[in-house]
Interface confidence: medium
């Protein structure tokens, strides 16, 4: 349906605290490097304007695309050239073309510090000064360190922002209350940045059909009691609302989400007898609610899949004529008899079926040569189960720090060439695999393993895309979606690698480590190690075990020192040289 | 739940023509997998024809190829099989079923349609 004002009509439908926070939103995740104040008053602006079309849809410029709009606006910012160099001459281009630029200039690792919280007094007063500016500022801080975070979901995690300080507020101890909960958001949030990245990738690098194929598969696992024909349908309007908000059409991806909320609710019946409790909430709860629903039984009556996929004599009149659909059906048939496997291997799965048809529907007796299509799969289901149940071992012996270490040797002897501050947060996160999913039942952990996994190695290949430096990291990375935590398993040393010359100042430690959180005093360490890695790369296990050991009681011993600095200054060299030497 | 209606059975003599009809209603025709079986006096059921759901792709019995068409009419939500040069040996009750589970998959095997029609009886004699 075409609307004679696009913007009075998200106006309408998203109502304006929605639409305000969206355009935030938006404007924070394409200018990254803006003061807040800038975004606060760009969004202002543009929430007037929409609400001067949404009371006179024929008002000036209304008609005009949401793009041609914002685009507008974002160029009126009087320091674009100085702040953002380049990004200015997307400013000069005309829709479409202009938003493609702006979205090419989206920086996944602008580099701002962490978010520190001030004092919980401090906190508190802003909060009950001006609560709408408080959260705004949460939205700007949020979108502008993750310019790909899904939009109505960050509207989400706003509000559940705003109710941590309307209970802590009022709280005895202020500190107490908010630490816990605030952390556990920042968890969530962070996870949540990573697993839309992931999609964003699968879209704009490997396409709908992709996205598509995984969509089909997850969902096919939750709703194991829809049919076919229903999970097509929600898996089309997913993509539309991903795509959109990957896009930055945010205003768009929110009312569609709202959308398919309410047709999700509305034919519960056909879907899932899970989504009951989640279609009595309000917009914004719903939507997040139906995304974290927990699985549905699965039908008591499924027959074997054989019976369509094997034994039946017109497989390959279904495959040539309808491919896509027909193999969607077998991924759909598929996932919803196994919601103990990985997304990613159901995809494996799918492909290696879709690659016995192509070979087999070409020979003279197809059944023949089909047969035993499904024993086929069994190493490829055995592979992510024994590196699951390898690296679960490994983590329940050397527990979180210790398992990130060992990672951390690992990719880095696999790509010795990349950024170690990317190999330190990328080994740090997958070392939280350990932690996420070791604890959980059996037939859990591959699904949540191996799918956590593959979203920190979208991160991996996201920041490497920036500046590559790898030809191994840019393979694993470009070739296969499903495929990349396979390839990057796959890797061994890399023996083409020159060792980095030795730089002490990158060994030299001060007495402002003490003092740091634990969590960064560890990024230290493992950014030593690191860097002891790309000069030693030969180094094994055990020097490594020892160095590191020794590392540790260092700083421990210069920590508790009466003279810190002069303790770090005194004891640093000669521990560098007791490594050197240790590694020789 | 899909629900199924036939009609259009009856009596004709051997050679001439008759056109079935199946009403759905509880889902749309277009998106399920929907064949016609038939069944004569002590013998089993057997796969008539059948058309994939999402994807027009029909399938027929050997014994019935050249001679039957299966098609649906999305508007009116109805499957149809328009039977010309019938033979006495396709006297039987023809049944409509549906497969809503698997689109596009028509199978040739009874067990695996969960709905059925009550069936309409098609008697070829002279």
């Known amino acids: 349906e075409a609307y004679k004002s696009e913007i009075a009509h998200r106006y309408n439908d998203l109502g304006e605290e929605h639409f305000r926070g969206l355009v935030l939103v938006a404007f924070s995740q394409y200018l990254q490097q803006c003061p807040f104040e800038d975004h606060v008053k760009l969004a202002k602006e543009v929430t007037e304007f929409a609400k001067a079309c949404a009371a006179e849809e024929s008002g000036a410029n209304c008609d005009k695309s949401l793009h041609t709009l914002f685009g507008d606006k974002l160029c009126t910012v009087a320091s674009l050239r100085d702040k953002y160099g380049d990004m200015a001459d997307c400013c000069e281009k005309q829709e479409p073309d202009r938003n493609e630029c702006f979205l090419a200039h989206k920086d996944d690792n602008p580099g701002f510090p962490p978010l520190v919280a001030p004092e919980p007094d401090a906190l508190c007063a802003a909060f009950q000064d001006n609560e709408q500016l408080f959260l705004g500022k949460y939205l700007y801080e949020i979108a502008r360190r993750h310019p790909y975070f899904y939009a109505p979901e960050l509207l989400y995690y706003a509000q559940q922002y705003k109710g941590v300080f309307a209970e802590c507020c009022q709280a005895a101890d202020k500190a107490a209350c908010l630490g816990p909960k605030i952390e556990a958001l920042r968890e969530k949030v962070l996870l949540s940045s990573a697993k839309e990245r992931f999609k964003c990738a699968s879209l704009q690098k490997f396409g709908d059909r992709a996205f598509k194929a995984w969509s089909v598969a997850r969902l096919s696992q939750r709703f194991p009691k829809a049919d076919f024909a229903e999970i097509s349908k929600v898996v089309t309007d997913l993509t539309k609302v991903h795509k959109e908000c990957c896009h930055g059409d945010l205003l768009e991806c929110a009312d569609d989400r709202a959308d398919l909320a309410k047709y999700m609710c509305e034919n519960q019946d056909s879907i899932s007898t899970k989504l009951k409790e989640c279609c009595d909430k309000p917009v914004l709860e719903k939507s997040q609610c139906l995304a974290e629903v927990e699985r549905d039984e699965l039908p008591g009556d499924l027959p074997s899949l054989a019976a369509d996929f094997v034994e039946d004599k017109e497989v390959c009149k279904n495959y040539q004529e309808a491919k896509d659909v027909f193999l969607g059906t077998f991924l759909y048939e598929y996932a919803r008899r196994h919601p103990e496997y990985s997304v990613s291997l159901l995809l494996r799965l799918a492909k290696e079926y879709e690659a016995t048809l192509e070979k087999c529907c070409a020979t003279d007796d197809p059944p023949t040569c089909y047969a035993k299509v499904l024993d086929e799969f069994k190493p490829l289901v055995d592979e992510p189960q024994n590196l699951v149940k390898t690296n679960c071992e490994l983590f329940e012996k050397l527990g979180e720090y210790g398992f990130q270490n060992a990672l951390l040797v690992r990719y880095t002897k696999k790509a010795p060439q990349v950024s170690t501050p990317t190999l330190v947060e990328v080994s740090r996160k997958l070392g939280k695999v350990g932690t996420k999913c070791c604890k959980k039942p059996e037939s859990e952990r591959m699904s949540c393993a191996e799918d956590f996994l593959s979203v920190v190695l979208n991160r991996l290949c996201v920041l490497h895309e920036k500046t590559p430096v790898s030809e191994r990291v840019t393979k694993c990375c470009s070739e296969s979606l499903v495929n990349r935590r396979p390839c990057f398993s796959g890797l061994e040393v890399d023996e083409t690698y020159v060792p980095k010359e030795f730089n002490a100042e990158t060994f030299t430690f001060h007495a402002d480590l003490c003092t740091l959180p634990e969590a960064e005093k560890q990024v230290k360490k493992q950014t030593a190690l690191v860097e002891l890695l790309k000069h030693k790369p030969k180094a094994t296990d055990e020097q490594l075990k020892t160095v590191m050991g020794d590392f540790g009681a260092f700083v421990e011993k210069c920590c508790a020192a009466e003279n810190k600095e002069g303790c770090f200054s005194e004891e640093g060299p000669k521990l560098v040289a007791a490594a050197q030497a240790a590694l020789v | 739940e899909v629900q199924l209606l036939e009609s259009g059975g009856g009596l004709v003599q051997p050679g001439g023509s008759l056109r079935l009809s199946c009403a759905a209603s509880?889902?749309?025709?277009?998106?399920?997998?929907v064949a016609w079986f038939r069944q004569a006096p002590g013998k089993e059921r057997e796969f008539v024809a059948g058309?994939?759901?999402?994807?027009?792709?029909?399938y027929y019995a050997d014994s019935v190829k050249g001679r039957f068409t299966i098609s649906r009419d999305n508007s009116k939500n109805t499957l149809y099989l328009q039977m010309n040069s019938l033979r006495p040996e396709d006297t039987a009750v023809y049944y409509c079923?549906?497969?809503?589970?698997?689109?596009?998959?028509?199978?040739?095997?009874?067990?695996?349609?969960?709905?059925w029609g009550q069936g309409t009886l098609v008697t070829v004699s002279s």
């Open positions: 079923a549906a497969r809503p589970g698997s689109p596009l998959i028509t199978s040739k095997v009874a067990d695996l349609y969960p709905y």
């Open positions: 509880g889902r749309y025709i277009d998106e399920t997998a």
């Open positions: 058309i994939g759901g999402g994807v027009d792709i029909t």
